[in-house]
Amino acid sequence: QQQTLPKPFIWAEPHFMVPKEKQVTICCQGNYGAVEYQLHFEGSLFAVDRPKPPERINKVKFYIPDMNSRMAGQYSCIYRVGELWSEPSNLLDLVVTEMYDTPTLSVHPGPEVISGEKVTFYCRLDTATSMFLLLKEGRSSHVQRGYGKVQAEFPLGPVTTAHRGTYRCFGSYNNHAWSFPSEPVKLLVTGDIENTSLAPEDPTFPADTWGTYLLTTETGLQKDHALWDHTAQNLLR
């Protein structure tokens, strides 16, 4: 006999990276017939929603009108059908951005390199932080973490044309509070090679990460990320 219901999906709209003072909606999708949804923040009950009519609704939304560092952290949700509770969802890491300062991103030897050349990004932020994050735009976005007192190095190793793209970095004051994004740096990789087995090894990031972040900051448009694999947020853990 089943003791728990399948875990719900949890995600943030328009994005889990939220500029401070902007709004964000945390969505929890369970099953039709669920009479109650609970949102937990950092292990404690944060909000409750009871959909009406439950048999016609399988998703609830928890609205945060004004993002700040106190609201940033790990969220999860559960739902109930009758007396039976679900497994908790995966953890959603909600990050507040545009905190304090703007880092500077540079790339050595330069923004234009030859296939196979060793490339290193440098993210610098003079305020007190020790963790940095490098993000690459695009559908197959990548993220890397780096550490340093005022500057972190992100060695990409020998690059291929797969590394072409636009990069930005953040300083991280803690796992869930990030700086303003750096100005973008566009990496161009030229040169035809026979051996194309070299490929980036950093973990994959959800599709259109940066495009969606820009939607958040510039237009406030919303985009449904229900189909995202939010386990990619493991980069924060």
């Epitope: 540079s106 030897p109 030859i114 196979g116 050349e117 060793k118 030229t190 040169g191 051996n195």
Partner: antibody
């Protein structure tokens, strides 16, 4: 210490080819791209192109594309620059230079004279 | 192609004096600008990388500044061995391009 040692001076006829070598030592050859720069008598510096020895990626100045061929032999830590269809204007000193961000180490130069 | 323009073409300065050499890029190259010194019959030698970063073994009298399109190489107090030709180089985009050079001569 890092050293780039180039082959000796060459005198060539117009229309022929020349191949200049650059043997690297004192560092891991495959970890840096090798570039070629030339300097005509009394003139400035002109970039020909560069090669990544580890996987053979190349980039050329459009001016030399089709005439210059850059290769590298990892087993001997040697880079090569071959220039074909030589003309008198190709008379110059040819340098190899390691790109460690900037061109941090240079060969001593190879004088190529093109004369009929 | 990014065009690098150096000025002046020739600079006459007395030993012990300060020399200021300029380099301008035809479009922004951030700080991807390198300076080289070349003496007759010798290969160029790296002096300054990334606009202002000093190089081990290069005397402290050599310094660089600038970002974007305008850059300066300063030699604070000229020594006799500093009289040579100086080149700036675009390290931002291919083709990698050099300025035409500034000849620093004894006044």
């Amino acid at each position: 210490q890092v050293q780039l040692v180039q082959s000796g001076a060459e005198v060539k006829k117009p229309g022929s080819s020349v191949k200049v070598s650059c043997k690297a030592s004192g560092y891991t050859f495959s970890e840096y791209t090798m570039h070629w720069v030339r300097q005509a008598p009394g003139q400035g510096l002109e970039w020909i192109g560069g090669i990544s020895p580890n996987i053979g990626g190349t980039s050329y100045n459009q001016k030399f594309k089709g005439r210059a061929t850059l290769t590298a032999d990892k087993s001997t830590s040697t880079a090569y620059m071959e220039l074909s269809s030589l003309r008198s204007e190709d008379t110059a000193v040819y340098y190899c230079a390691r790109r460690g961000g900037s061109f941090d180490y240079w060969g001593q130069g190879t004088t190529v004279t093109v004369s009929s | 192609e990014i065009v690098m323009t150096q000025s002046p073409a020739t600079l006459s300065v007395s030993p012990g004096e300060r020399a200021t050499l300029s380099c301008r890029a035809s479009q922004s190259i951030s700080d991807y600008l390198h300076w080289y010194q070349q003496k007759p019959g010798q290969a160029p030698r790296l002096l300054i990388k990334y606009a202002s970063q000093s190089i081990s073994g290069i005397p402290a009298r050599f310094s660089g500044s600038g970002s974007g399109t305008d850059f300066t190489l300063t030699i604070s107090s000229l020594e006799p061995e500093d009289f040579a030709v100086y080149y700036c180089q675009n390290g931002h985009s291919f083709p990698l391009t050099f300025g035409q050079g500034t000849k620093l001569e004894i006044k």
